[in-house]
Interface confidence: medium
């Protein structure tokens, strides 16, 4: 089961779509590449600057709120899903 961590204060950084292992998987940073992009789909910050934001979870971009948040793996919580519950 997965929990969406409610962020009231923003987290912040680069996070790619999913980190599912127990150990944080860090993607290469540096933003998006690909020059001459025309008619691009709307950019998802989770694929660029917030690529590594969610330590044990999945980055979610809520476009109408212009917000990036984390959907934590089971047993993890916190803005960046970096804290493990003791249960």
């Amino acid at each position: 089961s997965v929990r969406v961590e409610q962020v009231v204060k923003p987290p912040q950084n680069k996070t790619e779509s999913e980190n599912t292992s127990d150990k944080p998987k860090r993607k290469k940073k540096g933003g998006k590449n690909g020059k001459n992009r025309r008619n691009r789909k709307k950019k998802n910050p989770c694929n660029a600057e917030f690529q590594n934001f969610c330590i044990h979870g999945e980055c979610k971009y809520i476009e109408h709120l212009e917000a990036v948040t984390c959907k934590c793996q089971q047993e993890y919580f916190g803005e960046r899903c970096g804290e493990k519950s003791m249960k």
Partner: antibody
Framework: EVQLVQSGAEVKKPGASVKISCKVS????????MYWVRQAPGKGLEWIGY????????GYSQKFKGKATLTVDKSTSTAYMELSSLRSEDTAVYYC????????????WGQGTLVTVSS | DIQMTQSPSSLSASVGDRVTITCKAS??????LSWFQQKPGKAPKTLIY???RLVDGVPSRFSGSGSGQDYTLTISSLQPEDFATYYC?????????FGGGTKVEIK
Amino acid sequence: EVQLVQSGAEVKKPGASVKISCKVSGYAFTNYNMYWVRQAPGKGLEWIGYIDPYYGDPGYSQKFKGKATLTVDKSTSTAYMELSSLRSEDTAVYYCARRGNFPYYFDYWGQGTLVTVSS
Amino acid sequence: DIQMTQSPSSLSASVGDRVTITCKASQDINSYLSWFQQKPGKAPKTLIYRANRLVDGVPSRFSGSGSGQDYTLTISSLQPEDFATYYCLQYDEFPYTFGGGTKVEIK
């Protein structure tokens, strides 16, 4: 209250290095990227790069690769920028800025650190 | 890198005037654009993000519009405290890039 407090003005000789700091308080340091921007006297703003304080991962504008090194000390909630091989063109005010994320925009800035490079 | 061309570089206006500043990106930036105000000796302050969203606490006389490559900051009725330099910033793609700035001076 969120605060970003930068170190004081520096005067350096050409070829020297300088390390300026940005100490934060009032929020969880590792939850927000720290950005660095510079402004030469009478000129516009220039984006240098950013660092993720949790991992210590930096990202740089191509222009500043090899010139700026961004680091953090999580224990003191401080971000650092070291500038190497200083030249007169590096004379500028350097700002740190926090990027909020809910929504994500630059919501807090340091007061700026003036670095003067002069022989 | 994405180039941001801001115009005019300076303008003179009077209190009560409507002021418009434009920024043109060298490619589509998907409305990932902020506007900043900077006063002498001070750090920049964000006014607008995502092209048209007003930061909390910023007076409603400031507004942003635009999409694709072309963006505008409008001050509907200039106030004495609005005399400053304004910058746009694209944050669609690394490295983020600023426009050259527009200095708004008293006529």
